[in-house]
């Protein structure tokens, strides 16, 4: 048994059917020494008296909120909460496997830039009862600081019978210089609380391994005199690291027509314009990536060829 | 993905096509090592991440972009002295900082070369005959080299007398060529930010 | 005690369904995960299928996937697999399991396809 | 196909010590746990270790389990005619979790 955090404990079960479970002996936060009585959440059974209680904890029903009192006032209360171990590995019942980029992903991450600024989001089927907390850090033995804000809803979408919902936050760290060469990942930790089960989700990176630039901006078509040829321009991201000398960026100009199975024309550039042949009702696109570093590609920017 | 490949103009700053050519070379050595010893640890997210440098150069300090100088975060001044004499230097644009990067990231190659060509001298010994370095990417080196032209004492290569462990060699191999890339893309930045200048 | 009583085993045509039904007892089915594994006669184990406790997530061994369905009534504590176009190579005793560090097994149950 | 390995068969006399290996990857019995059951001939598979080496109440302290890097193995000291049965390691894929991944199984003969 562990504390979460002030009056909230977890307690570990090796979770099989018929096991021991944990003893837990709780203790009233009171001078009091007698004609203390013990509750648990809203019954009015008691289950013991004392200053402390002894309980044998094995399954949902045994954990909750037990609370002290005499002569009906509340001492003290402590919330008993159960992290599931099953066959060697804690339970993953809160989060959805995003399965991207490969099985058992609970968290992905994101940045725009190198400033050291990334988000992380996750997915549950949940929609009550659920609480997240986030911490971060560059690297685990000797931590380096990174500040998490608080996790939030940021969309709800409908999956076949089920809901789905999306939960972000955002992180920065503390003192990040763009240019520097990671050699610690920066760690994520997520602890999930649906009612009365607890879980925890990491995810360890890199910044440069979780680079997604923004679409480029202000793209812009030029025809080209008696051609069917135009020139496509375009700039850099806003949210992208300066100087661009130095964080460059490639690109990607692609033609697609207004059927998806239309061969599409694809270029590739460094620079910030190109020649392409725009066909009547296709559209180009154009989308970004650290040029020396292949992380993920940025969304597509878009504009019609008429 | 393979990275474009850039044509120098006659006036470009003479090492940016080297150092692409490095940044491909190491890239695609790191991805074929992580192909033969798929049964090794050799991910990103399996090594432990070495920086053979590190407190023997000071390549992203004395290469810092101007506009990064005045994020405190990036100012780890270690003060590290070099000679600076290099042909990569545009004479009428040299200045003592620039030198001092260039003649940093010479230092960085020629440590990196010593350790390559140890390891390769090793892997050649292994009766599995496993993995090899690539000749290309040995050769990118020393062409960056060259066209750094920085004058500094030859380091002897390493020799070792015990029996080498063929298995340690290789996991070794996977911690340099992930660290030798991230420098790679370091260099690259630093050549296509001085050819901009 | 833990109880996990296997039925609905047989001999079937190839290409045809059969269903088979784990009725668990001693313990609080709905809150523990449940596998499906089989031997076929004189081969080595082979895990089929995995529900989590609310039927939430399933998964499925690649040789089964599309054909057979694992299922669970918490109502009945009762685990199902439904198996659909049964092959010749789908002969096997199939076992239901709980998930767990300490697990409980089923009596087994032979499913034999042929025609 | 099994990523787990076994060797087919082992034997030894009443007394002897008889060890079976179980030899997968980094990503099965590299990162997770290791089970071992022992089956006797028409019946289902009886639990031996859990956790790589810890015994459920009831198994005899003659079966041993351990695990070293991508490799586990279970040991039986002086071995005894009832222990001739079929064993099968057991552990997961940290990619495929929670599908089981058994051994190819090692036949065990008591001689004598």
């Known amino acids: 048994i562990w504390e979460l955090k002030k009056d909230v404990y977890v307690v570990e079960l090796d979770w099989y059917p018929d096991a021991p479970g944990e003893m837990v002996v709780l203790t009233c936060d009171t001078p009091e020494e007698d004609g203390i009585t013990w509750t648990l959440d809203q019954s009015s059974e008691v289950l013991g008296s004392g200053k402390t209680l002894t309980i044998q904890v094995k399954e949902f029903g045994d954990a909750g909120q037990y609370t002290c009192h005499k002569g009906g006032e509340v001492l003290s209360h402590s919330l008993l909460l159960l992290h599931k171990k099953e066959d060697g590995i804690w339970s993953t019942d809160i989060l959805k496997d995003q399965k991207e980029p490969k099985n058992k992903t609970f968290l992905r991450c994101e940045a725009k830039n190198y400033s050291g600024r990334f988000t992380c989001w996750w997915l549950t089927t949940i929609s009550t009862d659920l609480t997240f907390s986030v911490k971060s850090s560059r690297g685990s033995s000797d931590p380096q600081g990174v500040t998490c804000g608080a996790a939030t809803l940021s969309a709800e979408r409908v999956r076949g019978d089920n809901k789905e919902y999306e939960y972000s936050v955002e992180c920065q760290e503390d003192s990040a210089c763009p240019a520097a060469e990671e050699s610690l990942p920066i760690e994520v930790m997520v602890d999930a609380v649906h009612k009365l089960k607890y879980e925890n989700y990491t995810s360890s990176f890199f910044i440069r391994d979780i680079i997604k630039p923004d679409p480029p901006k202000n793209l812009q078509l030029k025809p080209l005199k008696n051609s069917r040829q135009v020139e496509v321009s375009w700039e850099y991201p806003d949210t992208w690291s300066t100087p661009h000398s130095y964080f460059s960026l490639t690109f990607c100009v692609q033609v697609q027509g207004k059927s998806k199975r239309e061969k599409k024309d694809r270029v590739f550039t460094d620079k910030t314009s190109a020649t392409v042949i725009c066909r009547k009702n296709a559209s180009i696109s154009v989308r970004a990536q650290d040029r020396y570093y292949s992380s993920s590609w940025s969304e597509w920017a878009s504009v019609p060829c008429s | 993905r393979n990275l474009p490949v850039a044509t120098p103009d006659p006036g470009m700053f003479p090492c940016l096509h080297h150092s692409q050519n490095l940044l491909r070379a190491v890239s695609n050595m790191l991805q074929k090592a992580r192909q033969t010893l798929e049964f090794y640890p050799c991910t990103s997210e399996e090594i432990d991440h070495e920086d053979i440098t590190k407190d023997k150069t000071s390549t992203v300090e004395a290469c810092l972009p101007l506009e990064l100088t005045k994020n405190e975060s990036c100012l780890n001044s270690r003060e590290t002295s070099f000679i600076t004499n290099g042909s990569c230097l545009a004479s009428r644009k040299t200045s003592f900082m620039m030198a001092l990067c260039l003649s940093s990231i010479y230092e960085d190659l020629k440590m990196y070369q010593v350790e390559f060509k140890t390891m390769n001298a090793k892997l050649l010994m292994d009766p599995k005959r496993q993995i090899f370095l690539d000749q290309n990417m040995l050769a990118v080196i020393d062409e960056l080299m060259q066209a750094l032209n920085f004058n500094s004492e030859t380091v002897p290569q390493k020799s070792s007398l015990e029996e080498p462990d063929f298995y340690k060699t290789k996991i070794k191999l996977c911690i340099l060529l992930h660290a030798f890339r991230i420098r790679a893309v370091t260099i690259d930045r630093v050549m296509s930010y001085l050819n901009a200048s | 005690q833990v109880q996990l009583v296997q039925s609905g085993g047989g001999v079937v045509q190839p290409g045809r369904s059969l269903r088979l039904s784990c009725a668990a007892s001693?313990?609080?089915?709905?809150?523990?995960?449940m596998h499906w594994v089989r031997q076929a006669p004189g081969k080595g184990l082979e895990w089929v299928a995995f529900?989590?406790?609310?039927?939430?997530?399933?998964y499925y061994a690649d040789s089964v996937k599309g054909r057979f369905t694992i299922s669970r009534d918490n109502s009945k504590n009762t685990l199902y697999l439904q198996m659909k176009s049964l092959r010749a190579e789908d002969t096997a005793v199939y076992y239901c399991k709980t998930h767990g560090s300490h697990d409980n097994w089923g009596q087994g149950t032979m499913v034999t396809v042929s025609s | 196909s099994y990523v787990l390995t076994q060797p087919p068969s082992v034997s030894g006399t009443p007394g002897q010590r008889v060890t079976i290996s179980c030899s997968g990857g980094?990503?099965?019995?590299?990162?997770?746990?290791v089970k071992w059951y022992q089956q006797l001939p028409g019946t289902a598979p009886k639990l031996l270790i859990y956790?790589?080496?810890q015994r459920p109440s009831g198994v005899p302290d003659r079966f041993s389990g351990s695990k070293s890097g991508t490799s586990a193995s279970l040991a039986i000291t002086g071995v005894q005619a009832e222990d001739e049965a079929d064993y099968y390691c057991?552990?997961?894929?940290?990619?495929?979790?929670?599908?089981?991944?058994f051994g190819t199984g090692t036949k065990v003969t008591v001689l004598g």
């Open positions: 057991q552990s997961y894929d940290r990619g495929t979790h929670p599908a089981l991944l």
């Open positions: 980094r990503s099965n019995i590299g990162s997770n746990i």
């Open positions: 529900i989590r406790y609310d039927g939430s997530n399933k």
């Open positions: 956790g790589n080496d």
């Open positions: 001693g313990f609080t089915f709905s809150s523990y995960g």
